[in-house]
Interface confidence: medium
């Protein structure tokens, strides 16, 4: 089950809940956001003071990593299992350092399996963080420090950190370093929103969020 | 293949302009940031400008802010650089350079055009 | 600005020597720097980036190393094909910056 699910058995507080995947005993403890837009948001990624770093591993991104009431990666294994199972929308929220907040909302969201390195499926963006994805169009494979699937002859993920899906190395880096304010700028590997902010502005703070199409 | 051409330089006036074009291909040129990087008769290299790669992100050095002018033309794989109000000191061959990624703030450049040399002189 | 400064400005060696050329940075550019090769009359060669990470194609008798203000690029074995003029340059902030240069020559 996913917060949808959890949202429709009646838990409509915002909070950590335990989420299971269809026909798996296996458990994960996510951020369920009851409230934003209808509620029912399963919370893939946070990012908002810094606390927890996000140069990781393949397999730390695969399993997930961070404290799912702050700064946490959910985990590509559960998403790609969960995004397959019915149709996503991706809701991708973000606030700059001068009190501004932006969307990008993502009518269709799957991750590809492990085997095909989590390359991520995106259609149909509308929102205020820009008219065109930050997310490269078509979607790219995931990378990580110790797993180099871009589309660069460089390493993206070892000059930007985090891990991404990059391309050359793209528009977007929501895993990158945080910056604090009056640092965050010129910082071309920060948390990276390129159609609404521009090169070498880094954010301050950016939650990934999901639900099912049909909620 | 990567190829970068570039066209336009000539000798020109004190206070003259020029426009200088670099015609890319074998790469996806709308893909990655690119720079204009110059170098003196003898001397070493000097970056001058850089474009991101939609066009809407532009950056100078101090020495030609406010005379030079970087552009592109995606639809053209093509990237200029219109020089005005030109100055003795900006005899040069100007290089056009492909960055290593689309980073706009991070300029590693890992290809370069053969060069087309500028020269201000009365 | 950041101002980036090399040595020594000219080396002269010989054919399998080892030879090391530093680059001293203004201000921390963490590991932000690169390094290009030009021979006379034409465009440098990128060789290294991000300090340490070899350009695909260039030989591994090449490597870089250093982080915040001192850098170094090391020619294990100097082939005759090496005899160039290397150039550092920060990546960290605008305005990008290169070293003066260092030519190396034959012995």
């Known amino acids: 089950r996913d917060c949808a699910e959890v949202f429709k058995s009646g838990h409509t507080t915002n909070g950590v809940y335990t989420l299971t995947l269809p026909n798996s005993t296996e458990e994960v403890k996510a951020y369920c956001d009851m409230e934003a837009g209808g509620g029912g948001w399963t919370i893939i990624q946070r990012r908002e003071d810094g606390s927890v770093d996000f140069q990781r591993t393949w397999k730390e991104y695969k399993v997930g990593f961070g404290n799912p009431s702050g700064e946490y990666w959910l985990g590509n294994e559960f998403v790609s299992q969960l995004t397959n199972q019915q149709r996503y929308v991706l809701k991708i929220h973000l606030k700059d350092w001068e009190g501004n907040e932006a969307y990008s909302l993502y009518e269709h969201f799957y991750l590809s399996s492990e085997e095909l390195n989590y390359r991520i499926h995106l259609k149909g963006l509308t929102g205020t963080a820009g008219k065109i994805s930050s997310i490269s169009q078509p979607g790219n494979d995931f990378s990580t420090k110790d797993a180099d699937n871009d589309k660069c002859i460089c390493k993206c993920s070892q000059m930007l950190t985090g891990g991404w899906w990059f391309d050359a190395c793209g528009p977007s880096n929501l895993n990158g370093m945080y910056y604090p304010q009056r640092q965050n700028t010129n910082k071309f590997n920060g948390i990276k929103w390129y159609y609404w902010k521009g090169s070498g502005y880094s954010l301050k703070g950016t939650t990934m969020m999901i639900r099912p199409a049909d909620f | 293949e990567v190829q970068l051409l570039e066209s336009g330089g000539g000798l020109v006036q004190p206070g003259g302009s020029l426009r200088l074009s670099c015609a890319a291909s074998?790469?996806?040129?709308?893909?990655?940031?690119m720079s204009w990087v110059r170098q003196a008769p003898g001397k070493g290299l000097e970056w001058v400008s850089v474009i991101s790669v939609s066009g809407g992100n532009t950056y100078y050095a101090d020495s030609v802010k406010g005379r030079f002018t970087i552009s592109r033309d995606n639809s053209k794989n093509t990237l200029y650089l219109q020089l005005n109000s030109l100055r003795a000191e900006d005899t040069a061959v100007y290089y056009c350079?492909?960055?290593?990624?689309?980073?706009?703030?991070?300029?590693?450049?890992?290809?370069w055009g053969q060069g087309t040399l500028v020269t201000v002189s009365s | 600005d950041i101002q980036m400064t090399q040595s020594p400005s000219s080396v002269s060696a010989s054919v399998g020597d080892r030879v090391t050329i530093t680059c001293r940075a203004s201000q921390d550019i963490d590991r932000w720097l690169a390094w290009y090769q030009q021979k006379p009359g034409k465009a440098p060669k990128l060789l290294i980036y991000?300090?340490?990470s070899l350009q695909s194609g260039v030989p591994s008798r090449f490597s870089g190393s250093g982080s915040g203000t001192d850098f170094t690029l090391t020619i294990s074995t100097l082939q005759p094909e090496d005899f160039a003029t290397y150039y550092c340059?920060?990546?960290?902030?605008?305005?990008?910056?290169f070293g003066g240069g260092t030519k190396v020559e034959i012995k």
């Open positions: 991000a300090a340490s």
């Open positions: 074998g790469f996806t040129f709308r893909k990655y940031a």
């Open positions: 340059q920060q990546a960290n902030s605008l305005p990008f910056t």
């Open positions: 350079a492909k960055d290593l990624t689309d980073i706009v703030l991070m300029v590693y450049v890992d290809y």
